[in-house]
Interface confidence: low
Amino acid sequence: KSPVFGPQEVSSVEGNSVSIKCYYPPTSVNRHTRKYWCRKGASGRCITLVSSEGYVSSNYAGRANLTNFPENGTFVVNIAQLSRDDSGHYKCGLGINSRGLSFDVSLEVSQGPELPNGTEVYTVDVGRTVTIKCPFKTENAPKTKALYKKIGQTSVLVIDSRNYVNPNYKDRIRLRIPGTGQLIFTVVIDRLRLSDHGLYLCQAGDGSNRDEKNADLQVLEPEPELVYEDLRGSVTFHCALGLEVANVAKFLCRVNSRETCDVVINTLGKRDSAFEGRILLNPQDKDGSFSVVITGLRKEDEGRYLCGAHSDGQLQEGWPIQAWQLFVNEESTIPRSPTVVKGVAGGSVAVLCPYNPKESQSLKYWCLWEGAQNGRCPLLVESQGLVQEQYEGRLSLLQEPGNGTFTVILNQLTTQDAGFYWCLTNGDTRWRTTVEIKIIEGEPNLKVPGNVTAVLGETLNIPCHFPCKFSSYEKYWCKWSNTGCQTLPSQDEGPSEAFVNCDENSRLVSLTLNPVTRADEGWYWCGVKQGHFYGETAAVYVAVEEKKVAGSRYVSPAKADAAPDEKVLDSGVREIENKAIQDPRLFAEEKVVADTGDQAGGSRASVDSSSSEEQGGSSK
């Protein structure tokens, strides 16, 4: 399918102008290649009418132009002084006319309505409000005022000053007669329907002296705004419906093949399961406007979307709506990355998050999607070091591997960590992506002691066992802080008995702190990686105590606990409104976890190269 996208149908009236916008993937080649607007003939050939290279056909001379916007990946065709001869089938495209990089556009130019002289034209979107003004002379001031709708040759009474209201307009129309001296009455119609479209007649008085005024009411369906986004990327629908519906339930729905509209999400808590984990309805502002963010775009997300307001949280005739036509470009600049990452209880995951490589300096964030009600995504970690307190010691955001990808590591996994997480930056919002973490059956590959108590001034050796499959990986120990995990010197040791299946290939990497200082207290991670790509990690908490005990201190793998002592962290997921997703800088004033002290100095974190067999009898 062609990646070029534009409006399928354009309609206008004789004498008017149209502006047609076409989208294309903004690759270097596409930005500079020829853009064209051509008309399809009976033979199937498409005759160029206007192109980006300056060509304009004779019947478009002086009334059409084509402007390319390479930075946006769009070009716009403007056509003025339309005639009915302009009705027909067209293509907007790139390159040569016969190639497939194009989009079909149907243009329909109709004859303008022949309106009586002095007719006032009111053009209003469906669901909105219109105020029809009806002037009258002084002698008709005390007489009956009325509004009629012309249907064919007859006039149907809509409302009058004697309290009559046509049932079709019940509860949404009112007639206002001003005080003395003002020779004008008004009729206000709310929640306009398409069926309200037509010619109206204001009347004051009766007989030959009556005052009459014609009003042509054109109720328009909102023109869908074209939205062109990349596969796997993100789209934001901004919906501003007006103050009059500020306190009414809001929704976003997608038009289906039956031309009804299926709710995607609404403020009453309904959400389409196809968007689980990848949609947020941002809280509305005082003016009633709101936005819906969808990440992880799929080709099947394409279509026509409507946002609106109604107490039922779904589309109803006569209520204001806004419309979008979403096109998902399969020639995506957003790289493929796993949408599901699996980890085992007690183990870890390393999530790769894409970002726009042109924005390497942007702040990077990771948040946890909460599905209840409208959805929200409290931030857990950011590249400047903020970490939610209950993730202390087990979550880190790394700038590596860089060049369009950052890494988030989460360890000490529990079943409660299962869920959807979003990668985002404070830059290009279209690069937000979603990843689902699933907790599966299994054992962590890296084995470290559960909890360690070190003694001030003495030597501490912490072992980390890894299986043979990691023998080719780079192994490391690092000290965790809320700004990252600083790598410390460590060494692979001899064979370990921790893994029975491949004991000669099993390995041990150990960290030695000598001498132990107060600053050494905190979380340490043992991990494996290949270049800048991180694999599994395991965490151990080191407590430092005053008590003096003779001799060096070694944590025996045989006696090490299976997992660290759990502690209740003084923390909770940040409950921050989704507005912050649009501008993560809003988080800047939030409290961060205090740094856990100086990093252990390289000179004190030294190597212990003896094998585990030699030290098997050491006490913990």
Partner: nanobody
């Protein structure tokens, strides 16, 4: 103004169950983390459990993990604490509290409004 009213406390035997309820009013209930704390005679107020705005995140003190369950009903503006396997050391006045939404779910300082409390007594 914000009002939190606890109910459901009482006398129960060791191993028994109770369900505490907290009715909230005067706030946009669905925007806040809510928590339960308790205070035994002569002791400091301590964290028991908390639940996030949307209910997707919950936190528990180690001493109640696996026995207590916190839940909420945003439509009814209610928060609940289901207490099973009660022990004599669970005896205390239990308080419902509204979070400040400053990111700390388990600290007393993270809450700005408190109920009057409901007494739970577990006899051996």
């Amino acid at each position: 103004q914000v009002q939190l009213v606890e109910s459901g406390g009482g006398l129960v035997q060791t191993g028994g169950s109770l369900r505490l309820s907290c009715a909230a009013s005067g706030l946009t209930f669905s925007s806040y983390t809510m928590g339960w704390f308790r205070q035994a005679p002569g002791k400091e107020r301590e964290f028991v459990a908390a639940i996030s705005w949307g209910g997707a995140s919950t936190w528990y003190a180690d001493s109640v993990k696996g026995r207590f369950t916190i839940s909420r009903d945003n439509a009814k503006t209610m928060v609940y604490l289901q207490m099973n396997g009660l022990k004599p050391e669970d005896t205390a006045v239990y308080y419902c509290a509204k979070g400040r939404n400053n990111g700390y779910a388990t600290a007393v300082r993270a809450y700005d409004y408190w109920g009057q409390g409901t007494l739970v007594t577990v006899s051996s």
